[in-house]
Interface confidence: low
Amino acid sequence: LPAQVAFTPYAPEPGSTCRLREYYDQTAQMCCSKCSPGQHAKVFCTKTSDTVCDSCEDSTYTQLWNWVPECLSCGSRCSSDQVETQACTREQNRICTCRPGWYCALSKQEGCRLCAPLRKCRPGFGVARPGTETSDVVCKPCAPGTFSNTTSSTDICRPHQICNVVAIPGNASMDAVCTSTSPTRSMAPGAVHLPQPVSTRSQHTQPTPEPSTAPSTSFLLPMGPSPPAEGSTGD
């Protein structure tokens, strides 16, 4: 004959454990039902009655099968630099992630605790490493033969245009100015934009080094993060 299925509450056989979605109540010394996600234990089991479960109240949740007396409080509302990517429901906590143009400076188990605006590279500096969901932009000085004339968290250093006759030589923050005769080659007529960080865990690849018309001496320059432009700590 098949073994008789025990209904909760029941006393487990010595040395055995309770089944899936059951827990052992020390007071009753019985195997009792857990409450499903979105519920909590309103009344604990006794030797003769099973656990009584009740739905979580507004702004509280339980994510797992449980026997907690109170549901967990959902996290505080998302701040202005965040977007709510998962709402607070009876079965899941609110998750806040950083809005575009910001990165997570201090993460928590799920979502982000503290967002910070992506650094903007000032003129003369370009993006060496783009920002990600969890890391800030890294700026670097533009190498000889390249420039950036923008304050941006996405623009890399671009090569100077090559002139037949140079009117004004380019520098790190300004393109070369040619005389009225057209340049032989315009390497990069528009700003090169790196993608904004997206809300995924994938890492952006390092931008490829920009071409330079002069031998690179960037190893002589400080390559650490540059300070952003004055007043550029965020929108």
Partner: antibody
Framework: EVQLQESGPVLVQPSQSLSITCTVS????????VHWVRQSPGKGLEWLGV???????DYSAAFISRLSISKDNSKSQVFFKMNSLQADDTAIYYC?????????????WGQGTTVTVSS | EIVLTQSPALMSASPGEKVTMTCSAS?????MYWYQQKPRSSPKPWIY???NLASGVPARFSGSGSGTSYSLTISSMEAEDAATYYC?????????FGAGTKLEIK
Amino acid sequence: EVQLQESGPVLVQPSQSLSITCTVSGFSLTSYSVHWVRQSPGKGLEWLGVIWSDGGTDYSAAFISRLSISKDNSKSQVFFKMNSLQADDTAIYYCARNDDGGDYAMDYWGQGTTVTVSS
Amino acid sequence: EIVLTQSPALMSASPGEKVTMTCSASSSVSYMYWYQQKPRSSPKPWIYLTSNLASGVPARFSGSGSGTSYSLTISSMEAEDAATYYCQQWSSNPLTFGAGTKLEIK
């Protein structure tokens, strides 16, 4: 009115543990986090750790092995426990409030409790 | 960890004088916070998010800066401004404070 009140003052023997309770009023621990900061005699401020509104904690790496912060939301109390105290842990210990969803400044501080480590 | 270096460590100013103290970070930070502390008192929030004055702070105070360089300025020193000022960052864990600038009245 927002208030934070640390228990104390305390005299602790070297190698013993320190326990401080921060009792708060005028706000809920389910909406605000609480930081712990200390100030050694004649010295500056040193951050020790924080317990967030959701119960998560972050500790300074220098103290992570001997510091524990917990709380009881219903009693509006935050509990600070540090083990293995030495003479250089003598300091004023402060709890301070921080808005999880705001500007992250510690906007209200307790009056501090003086902890002396001495045999 | 990000180390915050405040300078000068000690300064004195006459009433009406303009005062500037600086806070230099070992790595770039997003924002700086400033706290004022007087003897036998708890620190008080003074400036948050680099340039915003905390509630009750006189308008003669201002904060500015970006990257690794930040400053607190008093346009016209008053006797009640004598205190120690601490900068603080939390752009990366752990949260750190500067060693403080003690401002005295001449």
